[in-house]
Amino acid sequence: PGPPPGPPRVSPDPRAELDSTVLLTRSLLADTRQLAAQLRDKFPADGDHNLDSLPTLAMSAGALGALQLPGVLTRLRADLLSYLRHVQWLRRAGGSSLKTLEPELGTLQARLDRLLRRLQLLMSRLALPQPPPDPPAPPLAPPSSAWGGIRAAHAILGGLHLTLDWAVRGLLLLKTRL
């Protein structure tokens, strides 16, 4: 062993990382809420819309207390990755009517990508099991019509909103355990 190393270069502590992840998730939640409202204004939703390919909501707020850190982060990352793919798909195959949601959809996609990288780094710093960030997934079929694309957008933004709301609560709770 040689001489002691000089002062280490400083990167964020996991707890600080968790703080900034919460801030990013809150900001993404606000973006999603705003975009969903914009979509409702332009194309009012006739009832609830579902998309079979979307993940089911991870957890009710009441059941959060029993969650463990690895489970929350793994599930959250898997769900957000699915939403990222759906947003990409929406931008690519959603049709001309959804072009009115640009550049906001593009910003949402970039922030979602950033949040996923944050979660990956957090899991790495904590040395938690790390499922592959980009697992292979079957391609999503294009919407059957323009209205199908709009219905899909309602479902995607609505589901993402619920997931991010759950994520903020979950991450704040986890911070108390770290």
Epitope: P8, S11, D13, P14, R15, L69, P70, R117, Q120, L121, S124, R125, L126, A127, L128, P129, Q130, P131, P132, P133, D134, P135, L178
Partner: antibody
């Protein structure tokens, strides 16, 4: 200032055992996963083992599986590596490292020779 | 043999820009895991240089930058200085090993 200080290295015969320790200070030890990484003389870095922030997950490189055991004591801010059935090819400087790893100690030399 | 492949050596003159490549596979870099870079000055312990593909810890000059694409990554050093002479290692998580893997290291010589 972040400090990781390894100890417990030395000369040991093939088949023997050693226990390395790493004392951490200057950061929240219990919030970081911890690694052992080694470097044989004149060679590159080789990851040995990792333990999660709370000790619930432990992983090992194939080359040390079944012979080495990683553990930690968060109340003492200390990381350990119990090395059994040592072989000549385990001769290296052993570094303890925190996080990604973000922070590294200065290393302790383990020599396995008869 | 290392799981991540790096050129054993690289060189450049002061002020030049040099890049060091790091090639992995579908179980590490190609699976989407982040790449980290370390600098090991002669006789000292490694230090984190770049994390999460292109993030610099505070204290690392912006002459150092990282990028990642597909199954490979690269480290770029611009405005090369004599104090940059060191060994550089890339690392990424590997899902088949359940741990990080390192490249074999690149010895950078400043001519």
């Amino acid at each position: 200032e972040v400090q990781l200080l390894e100890s417990g290295g030395g000369l040991v015969q093939p088949g023997g055992s050693l226990r390395l320790s790493c004392a951490a200070s200057g950061f929240t030890f219990s919030s970081y996963g911890m690694h052992w990484v080694r470097q044989a003389p004149g060679k590159g870095l080789e990851w040995v083992s990792v333990i999660s922030y709370d000790g619930s997950y432990k992983y090992y490189a194939d080359s040390v599986k079944g012979r080495f055991t990683i553990s930690r004591d968060n109340s003492k801010n200390t990381l350990y590596l119990q090395m059994n059935s040592l072989r000549a090819e385990d001769t290296a400087v052993y570094y303890c490292a925190a996080g990604v790893p973000d922070y590294w100690g200065q290393g302790t030399l383990v020599t396995v020779s008869s | 043999q290392s799981v991540l492949t790096q050129p054993p050596s690289a060189s450049g003159t002061p002020g030049q820009r040099v890049t060091i490549s790091c090639t992995g596979s579908s179980s590490n870099i190609g699976a989407g895991y982040d790449v980290h870079w370390y600098q090991q000055l002669p006789g000292t312990a490694p230090k984190l240089l770049i994390y999460s593909n292109n993030e610099r810890p505070s204290g690392v000059p912006d002459r150092f930058s990282g990028s990642k694409s597909g199954t490979s990554a690269s480290l770029a050093i611009s405005g090369l200085r004599s104090e940059d002479e060191a060994d550089y290692y890339c690392a990424a998580w590997d899902q088949s090993l359940n741990g990080p893997v390192f490249g074999g290291g690149t010895k950078l010589t400043v001519l």
